[in-house]
């Protein structure tokens, strides 16, 4: 079954290559173990950046090795990305699905557009 | 904490109705499923569906099918089993149990006794 | 229906002894996020049943270490390692992964 997902349009990283996004989905009900996965597409590309399952009793948990950490709260998911460089703006679509209980649904966001601005490199002092 | 407690027992007649209540408190009635098992007297427990206590749609196991119906009372964060026309076969006690992914919480029972 | 069947029907034992109770399922309960909803319940007399471990071998919270879960796809074990008075009563698999969810026959454990 489809569910709309949101995102915001545009996030600009920090020069520390750290970019954070709300990933907002349909009201969950009763959802109980919700599988949010973030995407990153390049032209007609589309990898997997990192995913994660939380459940209604525990919190979301991304791959100890993940560049992904995140919370959730509701139908909420706080994304932050890590380790970003200039090389790695792109459009970051966030895909939602509620796995448990039946029915199954699926939803992913527009995707967010996220600028990342390698910072200039200091200049050596005298 | 967590609590569910159901109504008292019941001493009904073969084609009567019942209707038996399990009020939540502790959390978010909205956030976890209701689910109903019943037990006969000396017998094992047997999952007789469960209601989605934010859309109110329920799920009926096919022996379940017909005569039961689960409701909600959102507000009271209470749900409801009613067990139409009535049998001797009804005879049972019936729980209610919250879940997420797993039944964590239980109502105390309810018994349902059909005589005539 | 997907039909859990339980060994033994009784378990007498000595307190102190390990238990292990075996719960089949007629096919596999590997949900599709890959998560399998297998939970095991131990209901005492004149009581309601209580958790004691769920998605195959995780414990519920305050559940004692001395219990423990094991298993996949159709074969699952719940072992009891050092049995205690108060772990008498008749223990229940139960599959929750799919509809309708379905619980075991039940196994009585019991003072030998």
């Known amino acids: 079954k489809g569910m709309h997902a949101a995102q915001p349009a545009v996030v600009l990283a920090s020069s520390r290559g750290v970019a954070s996004f709300v990933c907002e989905y349909g009201s969950s009900g009763n959802a109980a173990e919700v599988r949010v996965t973030m995407l990153r597409q390049a032209g007609s590309q589309m990898t997997e950046v990192c995913a994660a399952t939380y459940t209604v009793e525990d919190e979301l948990a991304f791959l100890d090795d993940s560049t992904c950490t995140g919370t959730s709260s509701g139908n909420k998911v706080n994304l932050t990305i890590q380790g970003l460089r200039a090389m790695g703006t792109g459009l970051y679509i966030c895909k939602v699905e509620l796995m448990y209980p039946p029915p199954y649904y699926v939803g992913m966001g527009n995707g967010t557009q996220i600028y990342v601005i390698d910072p200039e490199p200091c200049p050596d002092s005298d | 904490q967590i609590q569910l407690v159901q109504s008292g027992p019941e001493l009904k007649k073969p084609g009567e109705t019942v209707k038996i209540s399990c009020k939540a408190s502790?959390?978010?009635?909205?956030?976890?499923?209701m689910n109903w098992v019943k037990q006969a007297p000396g017998k094992g427990l047997k999952w007789m569906g469960w209601?989605?206590?934010?859309?109110?749609?329920?799920t009926y196991a096919d022996d379940f099918k017909g005569r039961v119906a689960f409701s909600l009372e959102t507000s009271a964060s209470t749900a409801f089993l009613q067990i139409n026309n009535l049998k001797n076969e009804d005879t049972a006690t019936y729980f209610c149990?919250?879940?997420?992914?797993?039944?964590?919480?239980w109502g105390q029972g309810t018994t349902l006794t059909v005589s005539s | 229906d997907v039909l859990m069947t339980q060994t033994p029907l009784s378990l007498p034992v000595s307190l102190g002894d390990q238990a292990s109770i075996s719960c089949r399922s007629s096919?596999?309960?590997?949900?599709?996020?890959?998560?399998?909803?297998l939970e095991w319940y131990l209901q005492k007399p004149g009581q309601s049943p209580k958790l004691l471990i769920y998605?195959?071998?995780s414990r519920f919270s305050g559940v004692p270490d001395r219990f423990s879960g094991s298993g996949s796809g159709t074969d699952f074990t719940l072992k009891i390692s050092r049995v205690e008075a108060e772990d008498l009563g008749v223990y229940y698999c139960?599959?929750?992964?799919?509809?309708?969810?379905?619980f075991g026959g039940g196994t009585k454990l019991e003072i030998k």
């Open positions: 149990a919250r879940r997420g992914v797993r039944l964590d919480y």
């Open positions: 502790g959390y978010t009635f909205t956030n976890y499923g």
């Open positions: 209601i989605n206590t934010y859309t109110g749609e329920p």
């Open positions: 096919q596999s309960i590997v949900y599709i996020s890959g998560s399998t909803y």
């Open positions: 998605k195959v071998s």
């Open positions: 139960f599959q929750g992964s799919h509809v309708p969810w379905t």
